[in-house]
C-alpha cells in the first residue's frame, strides 16, 4: 500500500534535480575561474540540506545559510542588472554585455534558475509529485524562500547606478508584488546606490508611447525617491535593435533612439 503523501497545488520537484544542480555547479565553476575553489558536492549537500526532511511550508532563510556560505561570490556592485517579468531579454543582454550581471549570472542564481524543489517532513525523499504553490499553499516554501533570500542579498550588494529591465507589454509595468517590487526595491541601500535606472522594454513594433509616464512607473519613482535614491527611466522601443547595438555599438544605425 503506497504511503499517504501530501498533495500540493504546485508542480513537483524538477526531474533529475540533484543531477541538474550538480552539473550546473560543475559547469559554472569551470567557466568562472574565481569560483574554481568551490566543491560542487558540498554545494549540493548544502542545497539538499536546506529542504530535505523539512516541512515544505516551514522553510526559513537560515536553512539556506550553508548554501549562501559555499556560494559566496562578490560581483561588481556597480554592474548589477535587475529585471521583472522579462528574464529572457535580461539574460540575452548580459550574455552580450559580459561585465553586467543578473542574479542568474551568479552561481547561486544559476544553480536554481527555472527549477522547482521540495521535500517532505521527516523523510529523506525529494517530492517529485507536487510542491507548495506560493498563493494556494504557503509562502514559506523552499523555492520562494530561496529566491526571496538571494534576491534580497543581491539587491543589498548593489551600488552606484543600478539598472532594472521592465516589461512594457504588461498591464503593470512595475508590479509591487513581483520579486523586484516587493524585495529588491526595498533592499537597495541609499548609502551606496545613487540611481535606479529603469529600462522599459516595448513589445509592439509600432509602439511609440512614452511608457516612462506609465502610472506604475511613477509609483516606482515615488518609492525610490522616498528612499533617497535618484530615479531615471528610458524607453527601449526596439529590443531587437537594442541587443544588436549592444553587440555592435559602432554600427551607424545605433546613434538614433532605440
Amino acid at each position: 500500500v503506497p504511503r499517504w503523501r501530501q498533495q500540493w497545488s504546485g508542480p513537483g520537484t524538477t526531474k533529475r534535480f540533484p543531477e541538474t544542480v550538480l552539473a550546473r555547479c560543475v559547469k559554472y565553476t569551470e567557466i568562472h575561474p574565481e569560483m574554481r575553489h568551490v566543491d560542487c558536492q558540498s554545494v549540493w549537500d548544502a542545497f539538499k540540506g536546506a529542504f530535505i526532511s523539512k516541512h515544505p511550508c516551514n522553510i526559513t532563510e537560515e536553512d539556506y545559510q550553508p548554501l549562501m556560505k559555499l556560494g559566496t561570490q562578490t560581483v561588481p556592485c556597480n554592474k548589477i542588472l535587475l529585471w521583472s517579468r522579462i528574464k529572457d531579454l535580461a539574460h540575452q543582454f548580459t550574455q552580450v554585455q559580459r561585465d553586467m550581471f543578473t542574479l542568474e549570472d551568479t552561481l547561486l542564481g544559476y544553480l536554481a534558475d527555472d527549477l522547482t524543489w521540495c521535500g517532505e517532513f521527516n523523510t529523506s525523499k525529494i517530492n517529485y509529485q507536487s510542491c507548495p504553490d506560493w498563493r494556494k499553499d504557503c509562502s514559506n516554501n523552499p523555492v520562494s524562500v530561496f529566491w526571496k533570500t538571494v534576491s534580497r542579498r543581491f539587491a543589498e550588494a548593489a551600488c552606484d547606478v543600478v539598472h532594472v529591465m521592465l516589461n512594457g507589454s504588461r498591464s503593470k509595468i512595475f508590479d509591487k508584488n513581483s520579486t523586484f517590487g516587493s524585495v529588491e526595491v526595498h533592499n537597495l541601500q541609499p548609502e551606496k546606490v545613487q540611481t535606479l535606472e529603469a529600462w522599459v522594454i516595448h513589445g509592439g513594433r509600432e509602439d511609440s508611447r512614452d511608457l516612462c509616464q506609465d502610472p506604475t512607473i511613477k509609483e516606482l519613482e515615488s518609492i525610490i525617491s522616498k528612499r533617497n535614491i535618484q530615479f531615471s527611466c528610458k524607453n527601449i522601443y526596439r529590443p531587437d535593435k537594442f541587443l544588436q547595438c549592444v553587440k555592435n555599438p559602432e554600427d551607424s544605425s545605433c546613434t538614433s533612439e532605440i
Epitope: T74, A157, E191
Partner: antibody
C-alpha cells in the same frame, strides 16, 4: 529570542587547561558557522577560531594554533573551545559569536554572547 | 599591532556628526567587505554595519558605513550620549592564515 551563553571561564595557572562552552538557543544551530573572539583587559577584539556549520572545517589565529581546539556538538546546540598550555597573554574575556553569510559579500558576526572571563595567573 | 588601523579616540558633542576611519590594504579592505561593531561599556560587541554599508534591523539610520579603496569609515550623525562606546572595524585578509582581522578600536566620547 536568539541567544548565546558562554560558560567555563575562571582562574587557571600558566600551562593549565580550560574548556569553554557556548550554549545556543533561538536559532537552528547546525546551519551556522560559529567563532570565538577574545578581548584582553582594556584592549581590542582579537579573533581566535572559527568552525564550519557541520564541524568539518576549522581555522585558528596564529597566536593560539596548536594550543586551542574549537569543536561543536550540533545535537546539544553547543560550541566549545578547549584551551591547553595557557599563557598569561591568553587572559581575556572570551566571546562566542554566530557567523552570518550574505551570499554576495563577506560574512559578519551577527550575534554575540555576553562573554566569559579567563584569567591565567600563578 | 592591528592589521586594520583606527584612530584610538574620537569625540563630538550631542547633535554633531562624527566619522571614524579604518585603514587597511589591498589584501583586506581593498578586496573584502567591512563590518563595524559597537561595544557599549561593560557589554558584548554588537553588529552595527555589515557588508560595508548595510544596517541590521534595529540599528538607527544615524549610523552609516562607506568604503573607498583600502579605507572604510563609519559616520554617526545626530550624536547622542548613548553612542559613547568603542567601535571596531573588521574585515578579512587574504594574505593571512586565519584571515579574520579587526581594527584596534576607537573610543568615542560624547562631550
Amino acid at each position: 529570542e536568539v541567544q548565546l551563553l558562554e560558560s567555563g571561564g575562571g582562574l587557571v595557572q600558566p600551562g593549565g587547561s580550560l574548556r569553554l562552552s557556548c550554549a545556543a538557543s533561538g536559532f537552528t544551530f547546525n546551519n551556522y558557522d560559529m567563532t570565538w573572539v577574545r578581548q584582553a583587559p582594556g584592549k581590542g577584539l582579537e579573533w581566535v577560531a572559527v568552525i564550519s556549520y557541520d564541524g568539518s572545517d576549522k581555522d585558528y589565529a596564529d597566536s593560539v594554533k596548536g594550543r586551542f581546539t574549537i569543536s561543536r556538538d550540533n545535537s546539544k546546540n553547543t560550541l566549545y573551545l578547549q584551551m591547553n598550555s595557557l599563557r598569561a597573554e591568553d587572559t581575556a574575556v572570551y566571546y562566542c559569536a554566530r557567523v552570518y553569510y550574505y551570499g554576495f559579500s563577506g560574512p559578519s558576526m551577527d550575534v554575540w554572547g555576553q562573554g566569559t572571563l579567563v584569567t591565567v595567573s600563578s | 599591532q592591528s592589521v586594520l588601523t583606527q584612530p584610538p579616540s574620537a569625540s563630538g558633542t550631542p547633535g554633531q556628526r562624527v566619522t571614524i576611519s579604518c585603514s587597511g590594504s589591498n589584501s583586506n579592505i581593498g578586496s573584502n567587505t567591512v563590518n563595524w561593531y559597537q561595544q557599549l561599556p561593560g557589554t558584548a560587541p554588537k553588529l552595527l554595519i555589515y557588508s560595508d554599508s548595510n544596517r541590521p534591523s534595529g540599528v538607527p539610520d544615524r549610523f552609516s558605513g562607506s568604503k573607498s579603496g583600502t579605507s572604510a569609515s563609519l559616520a554617526i550623525s545626530g550624536l547622542r550620549s548613548e553612542d559613547e562606546a568603542d567601535y571596531y572595524c573588521q574585515s578579512y585578509d587574504s594574505s593571512l592564515s586565519g584571515s579574520r582581522v579587526f581594527g584596534g578600536g576607537t573610543k568615542l566620547t560624547v562631550l
